[in-house]
């Protein structure tokens, strides 16, 4: 991961703003505050962005090198099944759970976990780099 | 140094419209999601909308949807709220705020416009 | 939504005094909160967000802190120019919330 211009100067990542940090095509940015899910999917929306939906395997894993103990909120809910916000079903990683009452889904370093949507957690935004 | 500058408030009847405006100097406008609040003449303080930097997105609480806009012009860096079917209960100062940009609420603030609705 | 309740609602002190001003949350809101100052024309300035963090200009004798769901702006030694308003802000939860106000009176 690249960070923005704000922290960077390098040729290879100029282009996502300053706060955000870029990975391939995309820019993420990794909260410092914590929001409960709705919340979290406001603040996205509100800086032209989404609520973290990770596409593979392999932006999981990196995402997941760049993350910490402490969990955030992605674009995950269970509607009838686990799906990102965008509706297309979680099918390359499962999901921890311990209640049918924990239906938002956040990352850690370490796994997907489902938890209650009023819980205040960091959370990461998603957005295609200009 | 960041200035929000609020213009359009008025009396106006019940059912009636209204625009307001809100001028941003000292800051990047474009970088910022931008919000309206309210104070009623009770004192008591109301979020009534935001909108995304771009302006593709806005939200509203529930008792103002569908009688209240949020829009923006980047290129003027201005904000607007268009306002109608105006009750008795929209009656109150209305300020332009910046949204923090770690997600800390409103960091900045307007000095306001008044709006009164009353036949 | 989340309720604030901001006591006391009015608040009598001398020149010099300490005060504290308190919101409670109706349930978490980790340490989402601001506190606002508002002047008697109308302005509003925040002083302190993410619960005791002072914004930049804001003189030392504010103060904020957490106990649970309560949060408390704390004034060390109170100046004539601080007997104006003062509201809290949760923004963990939407909608944004705020407290009632405290108005803030010179004995």
């Known amino acids: 991961l690249c960070q923005g211009s704000k922290y960077s100067t390098c040729a290879s990542c100029p282009s996502c703003p300053d706060h955000w940090m870029k990975y391939g095509n995309h820019c993420y940015y990794f909260s410092v505050e914590k929001k409960d899910w709705i919340s979290s999917l406001e603040f996205c929306l509100a800086r032209d962005s989404h609520l973290l939906m990770i596409t593979d395997k392999q932006e999981m894993s990196l995402l997941q090198d760049f993350l910490s103990e402490a969990f955030h909120w992605v674009g995950l809910r269970n509607n009838s099944g686990w799906r990102w916000e965008d509706g297309s079903p979680l099918n390359f990683s499962r999901i921890y759970s311990n209640s049918l009452v924990q239906t938002c889904g956040a990352i850690n370093k370490n796994s997907l976990q489902a938890s209650s949507c009023e819980v205040s957690l960091q959370w990461v935004c998603k957005k295609v780099s200009p | 140094e960041v200035q929000l500058v609020e213009s359009g408030g008025g009396l106006v009847k019940p059912g009636g419209s209204l625009k307001l405006s809100c001028t941003a100097s000292?800051?990047?406008?474009?970088?910022?999601?931008m919000s309206w609040v309210r104070q009623t003449p009770e004192k008591r303080l109301e979020w009534v909308a935001t909108i995304s930097e771009s302006g593709n997105y806005n939200n509203y609480p529930d008792n103002v949807k569908g009688r209240l806009t949020i829009s923006r012009d980047n290129a003027k860096n201005n904000l607007y709220l268009q306002m109608s079917l105006l009750k008795s209960e929209d009656t109150a100062m209305y300020y332009c705020v910046r949204d923090d940009w770690e997600g800390r609420a409103m960091d900045y603030w307007g000095q306001g416009t008044s709006v009164t609705v009353s036949s | 939504g989340i309720q604030m309740t901001q006591s006391p609602s009015s608040l009598s002190a001398s020149l010099g005094e300490r005060v504290s001003l308190t919101c409670r949350a109706s349930r978490d809101i980790g340490s989402s909160l601001n506190w606002l100052q508002q002047k008697p024309d109308g302005t509003i300035k925040r002083l302190i967000y993410a619960t005791s963090s002072l914004d930049s200009g804001v003189p030392k004798r504010f103060s904020g802190s957490r106990s649970g769901t309560d949060y408390s702006l704390t004034i060390s030694s109170l100046e004539s120019e601080d007997f104006v308003d003062y509201f809290c802000l949760q923004y963990a939860s939407s909608p944004w919330t705020f407290g009632g106000g405290t108005k803030l009176e010179i004995k």
């Open positions: 000292g800051f990047t406008f474009r970088n910022y999601a």
